[in-house]
Interface confidence: medium
């Protein structure tokens, strides 16, 4: 988790002299309780947008949006404490927004907005924003949160952002797979404008089981220059297992940027239908 | 269902040393904050120090900065407050409570556990 770089963190507004800065997440009202403490955030809203920084990379970033209550409460607010929180790994980031100036009630409901968080793809995160001061221990809670899932780099936009371009993101390979005669594989798929290798890992499975019956792993050497884009074409030959018929089939690029964390492909080959056997004819009808 | 049960108190003279511990049960969430608060007779709680277990920042009280030192134990779901220095104003009975956000508004608290420190 980071803030974004490309510029200064504003939240001043007309009517507000605002300040961002840097937070622990451990906003120390609580340690310092006052008697008097704003409502909640309403309407928080989270949504995905993107931003380049000064270096021109494009990131997924958290869009964050919240309203003001129109209650007096408002005379006592302070500022805002952002947190977001990456939900696998426990990772937490926060700023705070410090009112220098009083709000007041004006003819349009407050707004406030931040995107600087830049966000993960295929990541969920939990957002909160709490008003400050925090309330007195035991009080009413003046915080909302939300839960914000980024898409993966499948994503139409996501794909071309820097994070999903560096893991391999606008390389499509057209993966096909075709069953050969004595039990082969014959796997064919397009090859990157990188002399890099890659890694074709093959797991068979039972018709309708999901422990496999199979592995194996078979090198592709870096391609020449002249080959880039060309399709490369394996044949794997299958262990000949009586109802190890499903065939997945991934190819694992190496690529400069991912190294040996690049997106992967896959394809599956299903088993072939069983056709329905007939009842068996008797060889003579009983008389009885 | 969350269970917080603090131990460690008890009397020591001015200038000695005490470590409450705080064991903690129940607890769904993979991350949370926990704080110490102290409650004085006739006086309003108040916090003393707190955690956050995702990546263990802390934060204190200006009244015990430098005497005091919160920490954590995952392996055993354990909060700690370690006291050095002690001073008799900071007898009371001590509390910890855990929090999924940071403002200890809607906490589970343990029974609490007294300190009693003498001049």
């Known amino acids: 988790l980071r803030l974004l770089d490309h510029r200064a963190l504003v939240c001043s507004q007309p009517g507000l002299n605002c300040t961002v800065k840097n937070s622990t997440c451990l906003d120390d009202s609580w340690i310092h309780p006052r008697n008097l403490t704003p409502s909640s955030p309403k309407d928080l809203q989270i949504q995905l947008h993107f931003a380049h920084t000064q270096q021109g990379d494009l990131f997924p970033v958290a869009h964050i949006e919240w309203t003001l209550q129109t209650d007096a409460s408002i005379l006592y607010l302070e500022g805002a404490e952002l947190s977001v929180l990456q939900l696998n790994t426990n990772e937490r980031l926060c700023v705070r927004f410090e009112f220098l100036s009083k709000l007041r009630h004006h003819h349009r409901r407050w707004r406030f907005t931040f995107s600087h968080f830049v966000v993960d793809p295929d990541q969920e995160y939990e957002v909160t924003v709490h008003h400050l001061p925090k309330p007195i221990p035991d009080g009413d809670p003046n915080h909302q949160s939300k839960n914000f899932l980024v898409p993966d780099c499948e994503h139409a936009r996501m794909k071309v952002t820097t994070p999903c371009m560096s893991s391999g993101s606008l390389w499509d390979p057209n993966i096909t797979v075709e069953t050969l005669e004595a039990h082969q594989l014959r796997v064919s798929f397009t090859l990157w404008n990188e002399s890099t290798h890659y890694q074709i890992l093959l797991t068979s499975f039972p018709h309708m089981e999901n422990h496999s019956c199979f592995e194996h792993m078979h090198h592709i050497p870096a391609p020449r220059p002249e080959e880039f884009h060309q399709r490369s074409n394996v044949t794997l030959t299958l262990r000949n297992l009586k109802g190890c018929c499903r065939h997945q089939v991934q190819i694992q690029p190496f690529f400069s940027s991912c190294l040996n964390d690049c997106l992967r492909h896959s394809a599956t080959v299903s088993c072939p239908e069983m056709p329905d056997t007939p009842e068996p004819i008797p060889d003579y009808m009983p008389l009885w | 269902q969350v269970q917080l049960q603090e131990s460690g108190g008890g009397s020591v003279q001015a200038g000695g040393s005490l470590r409450l511990s705080c064991a903690v049960s129940?607890?769904?969430?993979?991350?949370?904050?926990m704080g110490w608060f102290r409650q004085a007779p006739g006086k309003k709680r108040e916090g003393v120090a707190s955690i956050y277990t995702g990546d263990g920042s802390t934060h204190y009280a200006d009244s015990v900065k430098g005497r005091f030192t919160i920490s954590q134990d995952n392996a055993q779901n354990t909060l700690y407050l370690q006291m050095n220095s002690l001073k008799p104003e900071d007898s009371a009975m001590y509390y910890c409570?855990?929090?999924?956000?940071?403002?200890?508004?809607?906490?589970?608290w343990g029974q609490g556990t007294q300190v009693t420190v003498s001049s």
């Open positions: 129940g607890y769904t969430h993979r991350s949370y904050y």
């Open positions: 409570a855990a929090d999924t956000q940071n403002s200890f508004t809607a906490p589970y």
